[in-house]
Interface confidence: low
């Protein structure tokens, strides 16, 4: 939450550092140095050795049987007169050569050698951190705010007890940023500025540095731990898990060291783990900014016809419109090109079939005629014509197409098996003639399009992946009787003894990810929190908790009123909504500190200039941020006026609401995402908007754009009604 324009702030996390720190339990990802195989901590360069040019550099050698033995000794520095940074295993002589340097050191050069394999400790060649960065041994020596670090062996300008001799193995060398005790803020150092004792360094998380395109089949990065922090098993090892992905058997799959890969067409890269109880897990590698296909717009696959621009066409037509045969995608004759199956792994560039891998206006191919480089396959019919309807008009209540699968890939169940459930949430007799088989339909006039029931008890129903027909402008919210609906229901704000209690922020939820605040949320029902989809970096629900009844983001002073609840399910909002309904593992107990906030009436309009507030514990810009819940006051702005303030670059639709700051430089920011825009009407407070990532933090004269809750109110009620919460 920005209150004023200020400096960056992650020092807030009170990195008490050398003061009252107790020993910290190290997560699996960073520690557990017991008697275990450590070769996964090394980057292997086959048929390579290091030659020292500088004769002063030391080397230690010894006869051993395996590279694993070399690695274990290097990691523990056992019996070595230096800090081991790399080793070479001589396969012919069965010998280890341990080095206090690596290939990046000065006075050293790489050399080819059949019998040698070079292994370099990844900690010394990484320029990013894993977790808290306890194992970081890179060479960054400047703090977050740009101050040069004080050498660890020096007591000037700051006296300290972090002596290299007291922290053997922690590599307190030179003035490099380190995190010898695994503090929350990551690597840090004492600074050369007498006024600033210590500060964290701005070293990115490896998960931020690494990125992939598509589903990561071509990813060849250096991520070597899973999304839950488990270290990956080397591909060339069979312990603790035996597997069939042998590097020598699949030389093109990039099975280097223990890096995450996607050799088998999974949704994203994964690896076997060193945890004997977890055979494999996915890795948290974000999608690159210039990704050709991101998760939210995976096209609907078709084989007989073209949907939209045909990016999802997977049929076998292999001539262009006039009958000239297509050139194979994996061929460079007669036309050279880079649209190869290797470069576009998820675009199904098989054989010589027409495809649209690059977002052209329709499927195309290179032709076998040397004089005609490319041609469109415009003879493939459009799905809208061939299948009757693979798009819908208005809200799709008249959709009669044959799709019978939800957006998450579940097969729809028969309507006749679900009539009882349907009657539970609609108050009229549905048109049974439309509800044939298990086809996607919209019998309840859902604003967000056709849907169906599933056989899955956890996802009783879901929307189908059908788009509105191109050019269809029919409004989905139709309120003929009441052109302007009031947002408030006739109900008063709860007051005790004439004074509003802390219930006036009791609906505010702090969503915690791996024990840290990540997002806000609003308690709209005892078991349900409304928040944003950007708040869930991991698919493992055990990573999340909801804190209720707190005022301080760390829960200080809130012990009596704080409720900590696990998350049992995430229900994603309609396509493009950015909303998530988060189900709590058990209902919250409503009291003086925890309360629900009301939802607005569906499709309602709130008058311009209505005064509203956004709440959050997010990024304040304050270096001495106290962790208390912040509020910024905004006023509602009409969509047209809002668009003008955004210099016409933004066109708002019926699913968005705009609010501008009363005070320049205040408004929502990261860490506030998921939190509410709260407005009052007829003395009733309600959540009118949800904060989602916008266009910068509190930019002067740029109003904030929020998800309009009124547009999604029916969806929220439908989920609460149909996704049953087990009774305690």
């Amino acid at each position: 939450m920005w209150v004023t324009k200020l400096l960056p702030a992650l020092l807030l996390q009170h990195v008490l550092l050398h003061l009252l720190l107790l020993p910290i339990a190290i997560p699996y990802a960073e520690g557990q140095r017991k008697r275990r195989n450590t070769i996964h901590e090394f980057k292997k360069s086959a048929k390579t050795t290091l030659i020292k040019i500088d004769p002063a550099l030391k080397i230690k050698t010894k006869k051993v049987n395996t590279a694993d033995q070399c690695a274990n000794r290097c990691t523990r520095n056992k019996g070595l007169p230096f800090t081991c940074k790399a080793f070479v295993f001589d396969k012919a002589r069965k010998q280890c050569l341990w080095f206090p340097f690596n290939s990046m050191s000065s006075g050293v050069k790489k050399e080819f050698g059949h019998e040698f394999d070079l292994y370099e400790n990844k900690d010394y060649i990484r320029n990013c951190i894993i977790g808290k960065g306890r194992s970081y041994k890179g060479t960054v020596s400047i703090t977050k705010s740009g101050i040069k670090c004080q050498p660890w062996s020096s007591m000037i300008p700051h006296e300290h007890s972090f002596l290299p001799s007291s922290y053997r193995g922690k590599d307190l060398q030179e003035n490099y940023c380190r995190n010898p005790r695994g503090e929350e803020g990551g690597p840090w150092c004492f600074t050369s500025n007498p006024e600033v004792r210590y500060e964290v360094c701005d070293i990115p998380q490896c998960s931020e540095v690494e990125c992939m395109t598509c589903n990561g089949e071509s990813y060849r990065g250096l991520m070597d731990h899973t999304e839950s922090g488990k270290i990956c098993q080397r591909w060339d090892h069979q312990t603790p898990h035996r597997h069939k992905f042998l590097p020598e058997r699949y030389p093109d799959k990039g099975f280097d060291d223990n890096y995450c890969r996607n050799p088998d067409g999974q949704p994203r890269p994964w690896c076997y783990t060193l945890d004997p109880h977890t055979r494999w897990e996915y890795c948290a590698i974000k999608t690159c900014a210039d990704n050709t296909m991101n998760d939210t717009d995976v096209p609907l696959e078709t084989t007989e016809c073209i949907q939209g621009q045909g990016e999802g066409y997977r049929g076998t037509v292999n001539t262009i419109w006039n009958g000239i045969p297509c050139q194979r995608w994996d061929s460079q004759y007669p036309h050279e090109h880079d649209m190869t199956p290797e470069n576009f792994k998820c675009k199904d560039l098989r054989e010589n079939y027409c495809r649209n891998p690059d977002g052209s206006e329709s499927p195309w191919c290179f032709t076998t005629d040397p004089n005609i480089r490319v041609g469109y396959c415009s003879q493939i019919p459009n799905c809208d014509m061939s299948h009757g309807q693979d798009c819908y008009r208005g809200n799709g209540k008249n959709y009669m197409g044959n799709l019978s699968q939800t957006r998450s890939g579940l097969t729809c169940s028969m309507w006749d098996k679900n009539m009882e459930d349907l009657h539970r949430h609609i108050f009229w007799e549905p048109d049974a003639s439309k509800l044939n088989e298990n086809y996607c339909r919209n019998p309840d006039d859902d604003a967000h399009g056709p849907w169906c029931y599933t056989g899955n008890p956890l996802i009783p129903w879901d929307y189908c992946p059908i788009s509105r027909c191109e050019g269809d402008t029919t409004p989905t919210i139709v309120n003929l009787d009441h052109p302007v609906i009031s947002c408030a229901k006739t109900k008063q704000l709860r007051v005790v003894n004439g004074i509003p209690t802390r219930t006036n922020i009791g609906w505010m939820v702090s969503l915690r990810y791996r024990n840290k605040h990540i997002c806000g949320g609003s308690l709209i029902k005892e078991s349900w929190v409304l928040t944003a989809r950007q708040c869930f970096p991991s698919r493992d629900l055990k990573d999340y908790e909801a804190w209720l009844g707190i005022h301080d983001v760390h829960g200080r002073g809130d012990e009596k009123c704080k409720q900590v609840l696990n998350v049992s399910q995430l229900v994603y909002g309609p396509e493009g909504s950015d909303l998530v309904l988060m189900k709590l593992a058990r209902p919250a107990v409503l009291d003086d500190f925890v309360s629900t906030i009301d939802l607005p009436n569906y499709g309602c309009t709130i008058p311009e200039k209505t005064s509203c507030s956004v709440y959050g514990w997010g990024y304040t810009g304050l270096i001495n941020y106290d962790g208390l819940l912040r509020v910024a006051h905004l006023y509602i702005m009409g969509n047209e006026k809002c668009s003008q303030h955004h210099r016409g670059k933004v066109t708002l639709n019926e699913s968005e609401i705009c609010a501008g700051a009363e005070k320049i430089g205040s408004g929502p920011c990261e860490g506030d995402y998921g939190g509410p825009l709260v407005c009052e009407q007829h003395k009733m407070r309600m959540v009118l908007g949800v904060i989602v990532p916008g266009r910068g933090c509190a930019i002067p004269n740029r109003p904030g754009i929020f998800v309009r809750v009124a547009y999604y109110a029916k969806w929220i009620h439908k989920i609460i009604l149909t996704y049953k919460v087990p009774q305690s």
Partner: nanobody, 126 residues
Framework: EVQLVESGGGLVQPGGSLRLSCAAS????????MSWGRQAPGKGLEWVSA????????YYAESMKGRFTVSRDNAKNTLYLQMNSLKSEDTAVYYC???????????????????WGQGTQVTVSS
């Protein structure tokens, strides 16, 4: 072909116990999380419990915690549900299900299940 066959259902008095089994075939059982669900007469499917691929993590619906125990024997390709202190409201057809995703950590209420058995009837009545 994936097959899930439930057994062990029957008539039991309130307060009594039953142990349901689910024999799985047609897929690598120890790669997948598994789940139990139930459907009472005239009601929708209700999630009961789930277990990760290796049995390391178990999950239960709130009303069944402490009374029901889910377990698995990967060597026998079998999933179990031990039900104690049964109540009349536990009367339902119980189904076992295979998770769509082989990832152990995705078991539980966030899981998506792609195959269900035919079910076994459990009746709790005096």
């Amino acid at each position: 072909e994936v097959q899930l066959v439930e057994s062990g259902g029957g008539l039991v008095q309130p307060g009594g116990s039953l142990r349901l089994s689910c024999a799985a075939s047609g897929f690598t059982f120890d790669d997948y999380a598994m789940s139990w669900g139930r459907q009472a007469p005239g009601k929708g499917l209700e999630w009961v419990s789930a277990i990760s691929w290796n049995g390391g993590s178990t999950y239960y619906a709130e009303s069944m915690k402490g009374r029901f125990t889910v377990s698995r024997d990967n060597a026998k390709n079998t999933l179990y549900l031990q039900m104690n202190s049964l109540k009349s409201e536990d009367t339902a057809v119980y189904y076992c299900a295979k998770a769509l995703d082989p990832l152990g950590v995705l078991a539980g209420t966030s899981g998506i299940y792609d195959y269900w058995g035919q079910g076994t009837q459990v009746t709790v009545s005096s």
